[in-house]
């Protein structure tokens, strides 16, 4: 339109904006490595850090893991987002007896009220199933409740409403994918680790604890027992390990109780962006060992500039142990340029480059 | 055991340039390559630069035609020329040697020096 003609003219003299056509606006122009939350930005808050897929941006503005609802036993709730976590949630029929940071560590079967009790509550994705004693004189023949007499107060005793544990049930306690038998007492009632014996005659404690070793009585040496691939974070909770099953990432350190896995990128490759505990984006290493490589004195005096190796592939170099077994990476996006100037004047060491000491520091 | 210190960052306006720093100790010849890396404020570790033992360079995207990377091998000392600088490269900037060895997790920011703060401010 003729009339957007010197708002467009004055927009693309602003190297910071840019004109959308599309809604005849100028824009602000997101920096670089930022990405726009909206159709046309117009002040830096509506520029955001792009993560990784499967990676969301945590509050402290770092590139997180999502975690994986893989497992046979969870459902994906939420989707990982680019500012929130995956969240999972047990399949339907189940309860979360140890929860995690946007998951369940264990998932169990509801229970199924045994005979003479009826449900209360029916389990959720959170809860077992409550059930109650069915009151005496009350059959499917009742119509109404009208016609069913409730027996007076002081006849019966009336239980209070709880889940059924497996003394009382024939219901189902295997996790989805075995394990060991765990006694269904309600998630917020946990005293014991599965598979421990009877807390009978220990002080009980939190949920999901469990000790370091057989914990003497009254003995402060208990801990928290998280999940496998989850550990036991700084504040407590029980958080996913990430995951290094990433083609261009290898272990560097195990999940442990206490800490997460470690994940770096494979040999022959250099991470260009962290992420914690990991690598968001790995890339070929671009430079060549200096005896395998091209002289840097021919480059210089062609002054050659050459781009980062395609996908998957080494600098043109002899394969060497270390270089050799890098997979396809992530979109490198190193570019590699002969600083010419650098390469006539700086003293040329006829050695290879130099290993460091064992501990790399 | 090697260290390094990194220095030369500051203050400076859009457009204006500085030179970085890394003088390194504890190597037994010229050095391996090395490596310059940058954590803006609630970022990630980000590799900018690297330069081999023999003097070749590679840049990121990002700050390829900005930024220059050279070394001193009799001083170990290795130097980051910034230009046309922006905003966004406002960080923490961090020389790590050996990359190809130690950079390969996920974090090589602080592990060797420091840093040196480059703020980039009108």
């Known amino acids: 339109f003729p009339q957007d003609r010197p708002f467009e003219d004055t927009c693309r003299g602003n190297p910071g904006h840019y004109y959308d056509k599309a809604v005849r606006r100028c824009c602000y122009r997101c920096p670089t490595g930022l990405f726009p939350t909206q159709q046309c930005p117009q002040r830096p808050a509506d520029c955001r850090k792009q993560c990784e897929p499967d990676y969301y941006l945590d509050e402290a503005g770092r590139c997180t893991a999502c975690v994986s609802c893989s497992r046979d036993d969870l459902v994906e709730k939420m989707p990982c987002a680019w500012n929130s976590s995956r969240v999972c949630e047990c399949q339907p029929g189940m309860f979360c007896a140890v929860s995690v940071v946007n998951s369940c560590a264990r998932c169990f079967f509801h229970s199924v009220c045994p005979a003479g009790m009826i449900v209360k509550f029916p389990g959720t994705a959170q809860k077992n199933t409550v059930c109650e004693p069915a009151s005496p004189g009350v059959s499917p023949a009742c119509a109404s409740p009208e016609n069913c007499k409730e027996p007076s107060s002081g006849t019966i005793p009336q239980a209070k409403p709880t889940p059924v544990s497996p003394a009382t049930s024939n219901a189902s306690t295997m996790p989805l994918r075995g394990g060991t038998r765990l006694a269904q007492e309600a998630a917020s009632k946990l005293t014991r680790a599965p598979g421990s014996p009877s807390s009978v005659g220990r002080p009980s404690s939190d949920p999901g604890l469990s000790p370091t070793q057989p914990c003497p009585q009254g003995s402060g040496d208990c801990r928290k027992q998280c999940e496998p691939d989850y550990y036991l974070d700084e504040a407590g909770r029980c958080t996913a390990c990430v995951s290094c099953s990433r083609d261009d990432l290898v272990e560097k350190t195990p999940c442990a109780w206490n800490s997460s896995r470690i994940c770096e990128c494979r040999p022959g490759m250099i991470c260009a962006t962290s992420a914690t505990n990991s690598c968001a984006r790995c890339v070929p290493y671009p430079i060549c060992a200096a005896e395998t490589g091209t002289k840097p004195q021919d480059m210089a005096e062609k002054d050659t500039t050459f781009e980062a190796p395609p996908v998957g592939t080494q600098p043109d170099c002899s394969p060497t142990p270390e270089n050799g077994e890098a997979p396809a990476s992530t979109s490198p996006t190193l570019s590699s340029l002969v600083d010419s100037q650098a390469s006539k004047t700086l003293p040329i060491p006829t050695s290879a480059p130099i290993a460091l000491s064992s501990t790399g520091k | 055991e090697v260290q390094l210190v990194e220095s030369g960052g500051g203050l400076v306006q859009p457009g204006g340039s500085l030179r970085l720093s890394c003088t390194a100790s504890?190597?037994?010849?010229?050095?391996?390559?090395m490596a310059w890396y940058r954590r803006a404020p609630g970022n990630e570790c980000e590799l900018v630069s690297i330069?081999?033992?023999?003097?070749?360079?590679y840049y990121t995207d990002s700050v390829k035609g900005r930024f220059t990377i050279s070394r001193d091998n009799a001083k170990n000392t290795v130097f980051l020329y910034l230009n046309s600088l922006q905003p966004e490269d406002t960080a923490v900037y961090y020389c790590?040697?050996?990359?190809?060895?130690?950079?390969?997790?996920?974090?090589?920011?602080?592990?060797w020096g420091p840093g040196t703060q480059v703020t980039v401010s009108s």
């Open positions: 330069i081999s033992a023999d003097g070749r360079t």
């Open positions: 790590a040697p050996d990359p190809r060895r130690n950079c390969r997790g996920g974090d090589c920011c602080g592990n």
């Open positions: 504890g190597f037994t010849d010229d050095g391996p390559d």
